[in-house]
């Protein structure tokens, strides 16, 4: 079975690769980036 | 295809002033974000600035924050970098960058050459 | 604070396969970074974005030859069948926006010789 720490590692690895995609579209749409 | 002819480089004086150009074709200016990236002479490369489609949002590393100003005039599909209080350690080519949807710097110009000597 | 390390120099054979590193500060080892070519006297041109978990996405006009892979912090640049023409350098560069800044470093670059 799958232990919540590892499902929280494994969700913690793609924040950074969310917030690059956020602010790639961000520069590109104009969003608010808060 | 992208295009960016980048102008505006030459030899200034410490604490003189100087505005580079980035001339952009090949693509729709207004869509995309714009960045300037600098390499001093035999050394690594450096982010300097980044800014929004529509210019509303600029972004600046600490090293040129309150000097550089970058900005762009959609209308004439040009990139603009104004440069204050030019230091020696500002002497560089001087490179503009297009961003994809994908990544930060996808397209490069072949750069202008800034030297700050007095 | 975000550091991307490389060496300096690697020398491979004509026809070989190249496998460059770029190493994430401990801290950000999920990072995801791009990897850059640099021929001599040209402009940086960008070869791809690659993931933590090795995916990678390549730039316009760069050779199925090059491919990326992960592991921990690192981040691999693979050439295959390696050509005069890929001698340059090759530099990595990571991203993140903090607190609604937005910070960029890259890495001091590798430089490949093709023997």
């Known amino acids: 079975a799958v232990s919540e720490h590892q499902l929280l590692h494994d969700k913690g690895k793609s924040i950074q690769d969310l917030r690059r995609r956020f602010f790639l579209h961000h520069l590109i749409a104009e969003i608010h980036t808060a | 295809q992208v295009q960016l002819v980048e102008s505006g480089g030459g030899v200034v004086q410490p604490g003189r002033s100087l505005r580079l150009s980035c001339a952009a074709s090949g693509f729709t200016f207004s869509s995309y974000g714009m960045s300037w990236v600098r390499q001093a002479p035999g050394k690594g490369l450096e982010w300097v600035a980044t800014i929004s489609s529509g210019g509303s949002y600029t972004y600046y590393p600490d090293s040129v924050k309150g000097r550089f100003t970058i900005s762009r005039d959609n209308s004439k599909n040009t990139l603009y970098l104004q440069m204050n209080s030019l230091r020696a350690e500002d002497t560089a080519v001087y490179y503009c960058a297009r961003q994809t949807t994908m990544t930060y710097f996808a397209y490069w110009g072949q750069g202008t050459l800034v030297t700050v000597s007095s | 604070q975000l550091v991307l390390t490389q060496s300096s120099s690697a020398s491979f054979s004509l026809g070989a396969s190249a496998k460059l590193t770029c190493t994430l500060s401990?801290?950000?080892?999920?990072?995801?970074i791009e990897w850059y070519q640099q021929q001599p006297l040209k402009p940086p041109k960008y070869v791809m974005d690659?993931?933590?978990?090795?995916?990678?996405s390549t730039g316009d006009g760069i050779p199925d030859r090059f491919s990326g892979s992960s592991s921990g912090a690192e981040r691999y640049l693979t050439i295959s069948s390696l050509q005069s023409e890929d001698e340059a350098d090759y530099i990595c560069?990571?991203?993140?926006?903090?607190?609604?800044?937005?910070?960029?470093?890259f890495g001091g670059g590798t430089k490949l010789t093709v023997l």
């Open positions: 401990s801290q950000h080892s999920t990072y995801t």
């Open positions: 560069g990571v991203g993140d926006t903090i607190k609604e800044q937005f910070v960029y470093v």
């Open positions: 690659l993931k933590q978990d090795g995916s990678h």
